[in-house]
């Protein structure tokens, strides 16, 4: 779940399942003001999904997105 809009959004819960990588268009990280860290993936259908950055798949997706930018 998200609080507010993108740049200041916080994650209060994380997706419980891995999103297929080819569904993801972009990502951003939640603010350092948030109570817990989070990565928000933007899907190609314009959904925003909170993911846990301590999950290996999240780290890989973020890295792949940054290196392909």
């Amino acid at each position: 779940s998200l609080a507010a809009d993108t740049p200041t959004a916080c994650c209060f819960s994380y997706t419980s399942r891995q999103i297929p990588q080819n569904f993801i268009a972009d990502y951003f990280e939640t603010s350092s003001q948030c109570s817990k860290p989070g990565v928000i993936f933007l899907t190609k259908r314009s959904r925003q999904v909170c993911a846990d950055p301590s999950e290996e798949w999240v780290q890989k997706y973020v890295s792949d997105l940054e290196l392909s930018a």
């Epitope: 990280e29 939640t30 350092s32 860290p37 989070g38 990565v39 846990d52 950055p53 301590s54 290996e56 999240v58 780290q59 890989k60 973020v62 890295s63």
Partner: nanobody
Framework: EVQLVESGGGLVQPGGSLRLSCVAS????????LGWYRQVPGGQRELVAS???????NYAESVKGRFTISRDNFKNTVYLQMDNLKPEDTAVYYC???????WGQGTQVTVSS
């Protein structure tokens, strides 16, 4: 409070080597992916190399075969071994944990003859 302290930069001749270190505190280090980024004056910060909590690595095309990222979870430290350095590697290098976009002061790497 999350803190990241980078070190190991300096002036080196083309073809030389440097090893950068980044010590992190304030996070459960072993759980997070870590990345080394670099920034040139007036440019954007770009990811150079990353390593996941499980040890999988990923590199920018421009540094593949020359740079090696590693981590020591007991020392809360991530390293960047930089070999066969080129003038275009000149930049300020920063480390960061994925999902905790905090930055240290960076360490300057200058490759020049």
């Amino acid at each position: 409070e999350v803190q990241l302290v980078e070190s190991g930069g300096g002036l080196v001749q083309p073809g030389g080597s440097l090893r950068l270190s980044c010590v992190a505190s304030g996070i459960n280090f072993s759980r997070y992916g870590l990345g080394w980024y670099r920034q040139v004056p007036g440019g954007q910060r770009e990811l150079v190399a990353s390593i996941t909590s499980g040890g999988s690595t990923n590199y920018a095309e421009s540094v593949k075969g020359r740079f090696t990222i590693s981590r020591d979870n007991f020392k809360n430290t991530v390293y960047l071994q930089m070999d066969n350095l080129k003038p275009e590697d000149t930049a300020v290098y920063y480390c960061s944990a994925i999902g905790w976009r905090y930055w240290g002061q960076g360490t300057q790497v200058t490759v020049s003859s």
